[in-house]
């Protein structure tokens, strides 16, 4: 009896496992063996497939075969029992466009309001995947395991950390990389949980801000308890994609070492020009907090973007405030050549309803205030560029009396 | 998989200064802490330190930073503790332990360990 | 230096008995607790991490639970080959503490 050729064949390629699959033809055939040929492009031999050679099942692995996962391959099969079948030749493919994304490493750190979620490669060192490397973005979903409702989290990097969450509460979440640049999307990693601890008695510290005074950066933050000691670190913002890089680690900034101050001062020339990543700690020497959230610092526009400096004329039912630009020591203004965007926060002074208001122009009205009452003002200036996404500290409050009624004119 | 090689036995004499030596593979040497664990015969474990293979920053228990010294050799993913002017208090066994990976927020489990290397303080 | 206190240094135990050993540290360190077993001329071997993770290649039987001060560690029926010592330690503060340790023997 003539052997058929097997049929359906499949080729599942995930990360650096490649993976073969095909139906039997004629099941009522028994002790049959599948083998399998490969060829390269612009080659006209065949050559036998390793890991695939005389196969009892209908799967074999042949990723033991270094190929260049960017060349067309075309491969063939063939039944054999006591004589052989006639070859079945799938269609040819290139690995690398045929390849999924598999399931990356996921490690997570539990804090009390926060997760720290570290994700990596599925496959180390991935030939596949080897200049695509550092491109990989990542998606998740996590959700709360006793509700199940789910919040999808979009393009986030290497770490990532989940804020305003519950103490105690345990939370799951399963992760999956995109290659955007080359419409990849992966398969998602097994489900991993884990519990929130118990309410830390100590805050991380919170408002972190840097400013420039002189030769120095000034870093302040606001914090709940007095008599504590702090600790800063920085990070390469751009090391947040490639933790795998052995450069990737927190690291002290030496005059912000316990620290018994809500700030702390460091020369301009500790950070070279970049992008940074910085944190705070609190202490009260028995316990430690979790880490503040992260605030980026951008040593470029750190050094030109400093608060705005504004008058305020005050009529009886709202402020007119003039926007100047900022001084530097020596009470020379500052040139800034880039278009600002200016946020004006002003709140009652016996109040600390606060309200908002964004302008372009430097003369800014505050509507609808109430006659002889004492409101404060603070502003800030962020940058129009999208790609220079920065903003100025607040300036400090300035607190003025409106004046009596009828005077808007 | 991931391995620490320590070798099984010292024999020291009193004051002198000895250095024990804990290779590691199957992992990426710099990547990770490695630590130090003392147990004294019948005794407990105690922490003695860390270091970052990476750039050989240290971390110690208090009680021990006038005692140990601990360097790594990057090029043979080795890692050392070197204790010095050794008393029958330091005879015990001292182990090597893989620490958290660098890049995490905080510490992490000591996940594999040396064999350990017996020290004896004798004349 | 966070204090680690094991319940009790040794315990006599039957084959198939459910056994709890407990663990206290005299400041919250949440959920960064760690227990090891050692056998006897043996390094330890990391069992659970993070208080409740049970680490691959040891059975169902063992599982740790716990939160702020205080942590468990169970064996639900206990076979001949969990006869060790079992330490748990803390990775939230250094320097990193270990208890005295609970040794674990057969009646």
């Known amino acids: 009896k003539n052997l058929k050729s097997p049929q359906k064949v499949e080729v599942d390629i995930i990360d650096d496992n490649f993976i073969l699959r095909w139906n039997r033809s004629d099941e009522s055939v028994g002790n049959v063996t599948f083998s399998f040929d490969y060829q390269k492009t612009g080659m006209d031999n065949w050559i036998k497939l390793s890991g695939c050679q005389n196969i009892t099942s209908t799967k074999c692995n042949f990723s033991s075969l270094k190929l260049n996962v960017y060349e067309e391959i075309k491969l063939r099969i063939r039944a054999e029992k006591e004589n052989t079948s006639s070859w079945y030749e799938v269609d040819s493919f290139t690995p690398f466009r045929k390849a999924q994304i598999g399931p990356p490493e996921v490690h997570l750190e539990a804090e009390d309001k926060a997760i720290v979620i570290h994700i990596s490669p599925g496959t180390k060192d991935s030939v596949m995947w080897a200049l695509d490397g550092l491109s990989f973005t990542y998606s998740l979903v996590i959700w709360k395991n006793s509700s199940g409702v789910e919040e999808r989290i979009e393009n986030i990097y290497s770490r990532h950390k989940i804020y305003k969450l519950s103490p105690e509460t345990t939370y799951c979440l399963k992760v999956k990389a995109a290659l955007l640049t080359s419409w990849k999307i992966g398969v998602y990693s097994p489900v991993h949980c884990i519990k929130t601890t118990v309410e830390n008695e100590l805050p991380p510290p919170e408002n972190i801000e840097v400013s420039v005074q002189n030769q120095n950066y000034v870093l302040k933050w606001d914090y709940t308890y007095a008599n504590m000691t702090f600790q800063v670190q920085w990070l390469h913002a751009f090391l947040k994609r490639n933790p795998g890089n052995h450069l990737y680690k927190w690291k002290q900034i030496p005059d912000c070492e316990n620290v018994k101050t809500t700030q702390c001062v460091f020369p301009q020339n500790v950070f070279q020009k970049g992008i940074y990543l910085l944190r705070v700690q609190a202490s009260d020497g028995n316990n430690t907090s979790f880490w503040s959230e992260e605030i980026k610092f951008d040593t470029e526009i750190q050094a030109f973007l400093l608060p705005p400096v504004f008058n305020i004329r005050s009529l009886s039912d709202s402020f007119h405030i003039y926007i100047g630009a900022p001084k530097q020591s020596g009470n020379t203004p500052v040139i800034q050549d880039y278009p600002l965007i200016y946020e004006i926060i002003f709140w009652e002074n016996t109040s600390n309803a606060e309200r908002k208001i964004i302008e372009k122009k430097t003369d800014v009205t505050v509507p609808n205030l109430k006659p002889l009452t004492v409101y404060c003002v603070k502003a800030r200036a962020h940058t129009m560029d999208e790609k220079l996404n920065k903003s100025s500290v607040f300036s400090d409050a300035v607190c003025e009396k409106t004046k009596p009624g009828n005077t808007s004119k | 998989q991931v391995q620490l090689q320590q070798p099984g036995a010292e024999l020291v004499k009193p004051g002198a200064p000895v250095k024990l030596s804990c290779k590691a593979s199957?992992?990426?040497?710099?990547?990770?802490?490695m630590n130090w664990v003392r147990q004294r015969p019948g005794r407990g474990l105690e922490w003695i330190g860390k270091?970052?293979?990476?750039?050989?920053?240290?971390h110690f228990n208090q009680k021990f930073r006038d005692k140990a010294t601990l360097t790594v050799d990057k090029s043979s993913t080795t890692a050392y503790i070197q204790l010095s002017s050794l008393t029958s208090e330091d005879s015990a066994v001292y182990y090597c332990?893989?620490?958290?990976?660098?890049?995490?927020?905080?510490?992490?489990?000591?996940?594999?360990w040396g064999q350990g290397t017996s020290v004896t303080v004798s004349s | 230096d966070i204090l680690m206190t094991q319940s009790s240094s040794s315990f006599s135990v039957s084959l198939g008995d459910r056994v709890t050993i407990t663990c206290k540290s005299s400041?919250?360190?949440?959920?960064?607790l760690a227990w090891f077993q050692q056998k006897p001329g043996n390094a330890p071997r990391l069992l659970i991490s993070g208080a409740t993770t049970l680490e691959s290649g040891f059975p169902s039987r063992f599982s740790g639970s716990g939160s702020g001060k205080d942590y468990t560690l169970s064996i639900t029926s206990l076979q001949i080959e969990d006869v060790s010592t079992y330490y748990c330690q803390q990775y939230w503060n250094k320097p990193f503490t270990f208890g005295s340790g609970t040794k674990l023997e057969v009646k």
């Open positions: 199957g992992y990426t040497f710099t990547s990770y802490w």
């Open positions: 400041e919250v360190i949440y959920n960064r």
């Open positions: 332990a893989r620490g958290g990976r660098i890049s995490f927020d905080y510490d992490a489990a000591l996940d594999y």
């Open positions: 270091i970052d293979p990476s750039d050989s920053e240290t």
